[in-house]
């Protein structure tokens, strides 16, 4: 029977900068029941606080609700593991909520085949940012990535769309049914999950184009 091994806070995520959750990985348990507590202080303060909510994020987590979440302030946090034989502490983790946002996927992905009379046909797609993200304040810049593939293909073709919420692709295989998805990430932060797949049938008379894709 031994004191517990050193825990590690390995992940923190926020859906929208208004709340966030951090997760830790326990060390060895030393063969005894172990209690974990997360304590933190905000940069520039000395007052230590305990995790306000150990439940919402699931096992080995700490959830910070709206009233505990401050942007532009670094949180300095650590986890203490204690059993009957002693204690061990994680390394301190410095967290700025601005940098840990993982948004929901973009919404309302629509995909159309456009066949203008005077130009080559192309695939046109547009989408909306996730609803929880407030782009109007300027706090967020969202970047987008698109992927598509023929239904039976193994490999995805990926395009970076920058900050645009619409995109054209000029080179596709006629007669194929394509899956299209989009995801987003803040300029500092993490990629969302991919949006649900949208399917589009490319007409058999779709003319292949030399140019691959182009941005609006």
């Amino acid at each position: 029977q031994l004191p517990p091994g050193k825990p590690e806070i390995f992940k923190c995520r926020s859906p929208n900068k208004e709340t966030f959750t951090c997760w830790w990985r326990p060390g060895t348990d030393g063969g005894l029941p172990t209690n974990y507590s997360l304590t933190y202080h905000r940069e520039g303060e000395t007052l230590m606080h305990e995790c306000p909510d150990y439940i919402t994020g699931g096992p080995n987590s700490c959830h910070f609700g709206k009233q505990y979440t401050s942007m532009w302030r670094t949180y300095v946090m650590m986890v203490n593991a204690t059993n009957q034989m002693g204690s061990s502490f994680s390394d301190e983790l410095y967290v700025d909520v601005t940098y840990i946002v993982q948004p929901d996927p973009p919404l309302e992905l629509t995909v159309e085949v456009k066949q203008p009379e005077d130009r080559k046909p192309y695939l046109w797609m547009k989408w909306s940012p996730p609803t929880l993200i407030d782009l109007k304040t300027g706090w967020f810049t969202l970047l987008y990535e698109i992927r598509l593939k023929p239904e039976k293909a193994a490999e995805w073709e990926t395009h970076f769309a920058g900050q645009q919420t619409e995109f054209k692709i000029l080179s596709l295989h006629p007669g194929q049914k394509y899956l299209v998805q989009v995801r987003c990430k803040p300029d500092h932060g993490y990629w969302s999950a991919w949006s649900p797949a949208t399917f589009i049938q490319i007409p058999s008379d779709f003319i292949m184009n030399d140019h691959h894709h182009h941005h609006h």
Partner: antibody, heavy 120, light 107 residues
Framework: QVQLQQPGAELVMPGSSVKLSCKAS????????MHWVKQRPGQGLEWIGE????????NYNQKFKDKATLTVDKSSSTAYMQLSSLTSEDSAVYYC?????????????WGQGTLVTVSA | DIVMTQSQKFMSTTVGDRVSITCKAS??????VAWYQQKPGQSPKLLIY???NRYTGVPDRFTDSGSGTDFTLTISNLQSEDLADYFC?????????FGGGTKLEIK
């Protein structure tokens, strides 16, 4: 404890490429961004770029955009920087440095640096 | 790019002195400044982040003051082990940039 292990030195020919490694241990590799910094003998520090090991997303200093390529191998917790078309100007010590936290780019852990010498 | 200027390349000092190393940003960087110490043959070591916060384990004789464009790292009661190069760094906007360094030497 946190360690970033880099080879001590690389001697390379002008015009060739070199791939520098930085093996991380003592923490979860995918949690923190990794940065690369150049230091020429007796000179200051220049930031080359950064990579998020969780998804390989990277940002570069425009000055090094055509010179450096950053990659990671999650399975071995190793970050790499490939330098191409080497000239004497690329002779320097190259450091990998781990982001201080989940936040802005200050660097709390540094490798010992790899001295790259470009010489025929 | 934001230029970080450390106008004193060298400073002659004595053990026990109070030393102030200055760093000036070419544009506003708020408090997004870090300071590093580098001894010969070693990699840099973080001292201060966010302009005024000492990193874990850094002695309290190291302090920083300033925000906006002008920053000062002060070492009070200088110890012989403090003789090193000191670099400031801004992380307000890409690309992150460093000052040219200030070397502390014994008089």
């Amino acid at each position: 404890q946190v360690q970033l292990q880099q080879p001590g030195a690389e001697l390379v020919m002008p015009g060739s490429s070199v791939k520098l490694s930085c093996k991380a241990s003592g923490y979860t590799f995918t949690t923190y961004w990794m940065h690369w910094v150049k230091q020429r003998p007796g000179q200051g520090l220049e930031w080359i770029g950064e990579i998020d090991p969780s998804d390989s997303y990277s940002n570069y200093n425009q000055k090094f955009k055509d010179k450096a390529t950053l990659t990671v191998d999650k399975s071995s917790s190793t970050a790499y920087m490939q330098l191409s078309s080497l000239t004497s100007e690329d002779s320097a010590v190259y450091y990998c440095a781990r982001n201080g936290g989940l936040g802005p780019a200050w660097f709390s852990y540094w490798g010992q640096g790899t001295l790259v010498t470009v010489s025929a | 790019d934001i230029v970080m200027t450390q106008s004193q390349k060298f400073m002659s000092t004595t053990v026990g002195d109070r030393v102030s190393i200055t760093c000036k940003a070419s544009q506003y960087v708020g408090t997004a400044v870090a300071w590093y110490q580098q001894k010969p043959g070693q990699s840099p070591k973080l001292l201060i982040y966010s302009a005024s916060n000492r990193y874990t384990g850094v002695p309290d004789r190291f302090t920083d003051s300033g925000s906006g464009t002008d920053f000062t790292l002060t070492i009070s009661n200088l110890q012989s082990e403090d003789l090193a190069d000191y670099f400031c760094q801004q992380y307000s906007s890409y690309p992150w940039t460093f000052g040219g360094g200030t070397k502390l030497e014994i008089k």
